[in-house]
Interface confidence: medium
Amino acid sequence: QQQTLPKPFIWAEPHFMVPKEKQVTICCQGNYGAVEYQLHFEGSLFAVDRPKPPERINKVQFYIPDMNSRMAGQYSCIYRVGELWSEPSNLLDLVVTEMYDTPTLSVHPGPEVISGEKVTFYCRLDTATSMFLLLKEGRSSHVQRGYGKVQAEFPLGPVTTAHRGTYRCFGSYNNHAWSFPSEPVKLLVTGDIENTSLAPEDPTFPADTWGTYLLTTETGLQKDHALWDHTAQNLLR
């Protein structure tokens, strides 16, 4: 006899990286017939929703109107059908960005290289942080961590055309509080396509849409929450 229900999916809309003072919605998708959903934050009960009518609804939304560092952290959700509770969802790391300062991102030897050459990104921030994150915009969320007193280096090693794209970095004051994003650096790599079918190029975005760029990063994001769940839970591990 089944003692628990399958775990729900959890994700953030429009994005799990939320600029300070902006709004975000945490979504939890369970099963039709669920009479109660609970959202947990850092291990404690944070909010409860009871959908009406439960047999017609399989998703609830928890709205955060004004993101700040106290709201940043790890969220999970569970749901109940009758007296039976589900397994908890995977953890969603909700990050607040645009905190304090803006790092500077540079690339060596330069923004244009030939395939096979070694490339290193440098992210510099003079305020008190020792962790840095390098993100490549586009279809998949490539995130690297780096450490250093005021600067971290991110060696990409010998690059291929797969490294083409637009990069930004953040300083991280803790796992869930990040700086403003750096200005973008576009890396252009001259070389051969690795596979016979060239994937469409990663889209690039102007600075003012950075806060929503990951909306397009996972294929079928709105339909396949498992993908999003994975991205969110793996990003900060």
């Epitope: 030897p109 330069g110 030939i114 050459e117 576009k186 001259t190 396509i193 994937a199 469409p200």
Partner: antibody, heavy 118, light 107 residues
Framework: QVQLQQSGAELVRPGTSVKVSCKAS????????IDWVKQRPGQGLEWIGV????????KYNEKFQGKATLTADKSSSTAYMQLSSLTSEDSAVYFC???????????WGQGTLVTVSA | DIQMTQSPSSLSASLGERVSLTCRAS??????LNWLQQEPDGTIKRLIY???SLDSGVPKRFSGSRSGSDYSLTISSLESEDFVDYYC?????????FGGGTKLEIK
């Protein structure tokens, strides 16, 4: 503003070699690749190869491997293309070009006419 | 190597007319395509990059688009200085390759 100033026209003998220069100004020379392109009289364009002035790294179109040698001198912000064992097939206008944040071949030199004739 | 087949090779048109030039790529090149303009004195200028983005200073009558493996340059209303040569160029994969060119002549 970005400028690529190429050396003047050359009249050379078959079997010899020639070195075409492309002097860059208006930007940090080592930050952008320089591509070279060939255009035979009344014909289309062919990509010869590319050099990274910062590292000296090169990549060639196989068709021009052994024919063209690309180098760069950081101190003078100049890229060079040497063509060896010249034949009449090498008579052409040669262009250098530079990319930008927005992709390849953003800026072009004015072209250098190389004529191979006995 | 990726082949770029450009058509037509020459085109006669009148001032004010709308014209389109096409390049077909033999393999998928994504959006890595430029359109170049070459003056009679040999000067080359990039008009369009990344398939559809207009270079700064290029008149708005020029536009680029894509349908599958076909890439188009459209001039909405021809002006006298537009009657020159045009080339497409793919920079998705080396060796980079050019279309054969289109000579645009005044009718």
């Amino acid at each position: 503003q970005v400028q690529l100033q190429q050396s003047g026209a050359e009249l050379v003998r078959p079997g010899t070699s020639v070195k075409v220069s492309c002097k860059a100004s208006g930007y940090p020379f080592t930050s952008y690749l320089i591509d070279w392109v060939k255009q035979r009289p009344g014909q289309g364009l062919e990509w010869i190869g590319v050099i990274n002035p910062g590292s000296g790294g090169t990549k060639y179109n196989e068709k021009f491997q052994g024919k063209a040698t690309l180098t760069a001198d950081k101190s003078s912000s100049t890229a060079y293309m040497q063509l060896s064992s010249l034949t009449s097939e090498d008579s052409a206008v040669y262009f250098c070009a530079r990319g930008g944040w927005d992709g390849k071949f953003t800026y072009w030199g004015q072209g250098t006419l190389v004529t191979v004739s006995a | 190597d990726i082949q770029m087949t450009q058509s037509p090779s020459s085109l006669s048109a009148s001032l004010g007319e709308r014209v389109s030039l096409t390049c077909r790529a033999s393999q998928d090149i994504g959006s890595s395509l430029n359109w170049l303009q070459q003056e009679p004195d040999g000067t080359i200028k990039r008009l369009i990059y990344a398939t559809s983005s207009l270079d700064s200073g290029v008149p708005k009558r020029f536009s680029g688009s894509r349908s599958g493996s076909d890439y188009s340059l459209t001039i909405s209303s021809l002006e006298s200085e537009d009657f020159v040569d045009y080339y497409c160029l793919q920079y998705a994969s080396s060796p980079y390759t050019f279309g054969g060119g289109t000579k645009l002549e005044i009718k």
